[in-house]
């Protein structure tokens, strides 16, 4: 492991995953590292090996148990330790004091369905995924709808300011198809994300109906 | 803003004691490493220790392993620094400073030090 200008991120989903980033410029891309987790106060210690994502940039899972179990709580630190094989011996390239709940990013939104589509309109509701009982309504959201000869980038951000799981979108154009992308934050922790963006959802607009104005 | 407060340093004989604090404040604490860097008269800046946010891993630089201990208090916002065994080389400004996140990197220590406070100078004579 080659001392390049190295980057260790790492986010809670809210129940029993860990997903953590490595990056390093100049580090060999099959240099052998894992992620080592201790907690304060759990029976459990847990690893996993960092696998290339790209050039210089490694990623893995810490697994903590079924996917919609709580196996962290606000009062929990975990210490995450980034170790990398140097010859016969492991050494430590990065450690934080892991606050689960102050590094929060939770998975995408799923289940995006049409609820009701008319020719300017359209209600789209979905369900938050492994999202912790303890945010209570304490989440926002973002959408965006991609319109046609518009890319993702360009689409105007919808803020959601409460738990809300559902929308309806206006001023659509009749007969068009448009998709539609929902993600998800909780208002608690100083390094918390977005989650990313859930999977688009297509849907067409209802043609105007024949001789009225549009 | 950002504030960080040393308190403790002053006139000390080799083989000596001292522990510096250091008060900080407008931010989460506990969300950030630490340390404690410093300069000797006429030197640029040594890394002497780091800590991670709960306390939980503690680096010391070779010259000072065995005789500082680095230590926090997150209940009450301090950083503490307890020099034992003090020799005239380690006369300097001792500085508290904070990291720019909770990730400390061992192979580069003094990488990602964000702010720091206006220094303590500690003196080793007879």
């Known amino acids: 492991a080659v001392n390049g200008t190295s980057q260790f991120t790492c986010f809670y989903n809210s129940r029993a995953n860990i997903s953590c980033v490595w990056s390093q410029d100049g580090a060999l891309q099959d240099t052998s590292c894992q992620v080592h987790a201790w907690p304060d106060r759990r029976r459990w210690n847990q690893t996993c090996e960092l696998l290339p994502v790209s050039q210089a940039s490694w990623a893995c899972n810490l697994i903590l148990g079924a996917p919609d179990s709580q196996k962290l709580t606000t009062v929990d630190i975990v210490t995450l330790r980034v170790l990398c094989r140097e010859g016969v011996r492991w050494r430590v390239m990065a450690i934080q004091d892991f606050k689960p709940f102050e590094n929060l990013r939770l998975m995408a939104p799923i289940s995006l369905q049409v609820v009701h589509v008319e020719t300017h309109r359209c209600n789209i509701s979905w369900e938050i995924s492994q999202a912790s009982h303890y945010f209570e309504r304490h989440l926002e959201f973002e959408a965006r709808t991609l319109s046609p000869g518009h890319t993702w980038e360009e689409a105007p951000l919808l803020t959601l300011k409460q738990k809300q799981e559902w929308i309806c979108l206006e001023t659509l154009t009749p007969d068009t198809q448009y998709e539609f992308q929902v993600r998800v934050k909780p208002l608690q922790g100083e390094f918390t994300t977005w989650s990313p963006w859930s999977q688009p959802l297509a849907f067409r607009t209802k043609p105007a109906a024949l001789g009225k104005d549009t | 803003q950002v504030q960080l407060v040393e308190s403790g340093g002053g006139l000390v004989q080799p083989g000596g004691s001292l522990r510096l604090s250091c008060a900080a404040s407008?931010?989460?604490?506990?969300?950030?490493?630490m340390s404690w860097v410093r300069q000797a008269p006429g030197k640029g800046l040594e890394w002497v220790s780091s800590i991670t946010g709960a306390g939980r891993g503690t680096y010391y630089a070779d010259s000072v392993k065995g005789r500082f201990t680095i230590s926090r208090d997150n209940d009450k916002n301090t950083l503490y620094l307890q020099m034992n065994s003090l020799k005239p080389e380690d006369t300097a400004v001792y500085y508290c400073?904070?990291?720019?996140?909770?990730?400390?990197?061992?192979?580069?220590?003094?990488?990602?030090?964000?702010?720091r406070g206006q220094g303590i100078q500690v003196t080793v004579s007879s």
């Open positions: 400073a904070k990291y720019d996140s909770s990730t400390y990197y061992p192979p580069t220590p003094a990488r990602g030090i964000a702010d």
């Open positions: 407008g931010f989460t604490f506990s969300n950030y490493a």
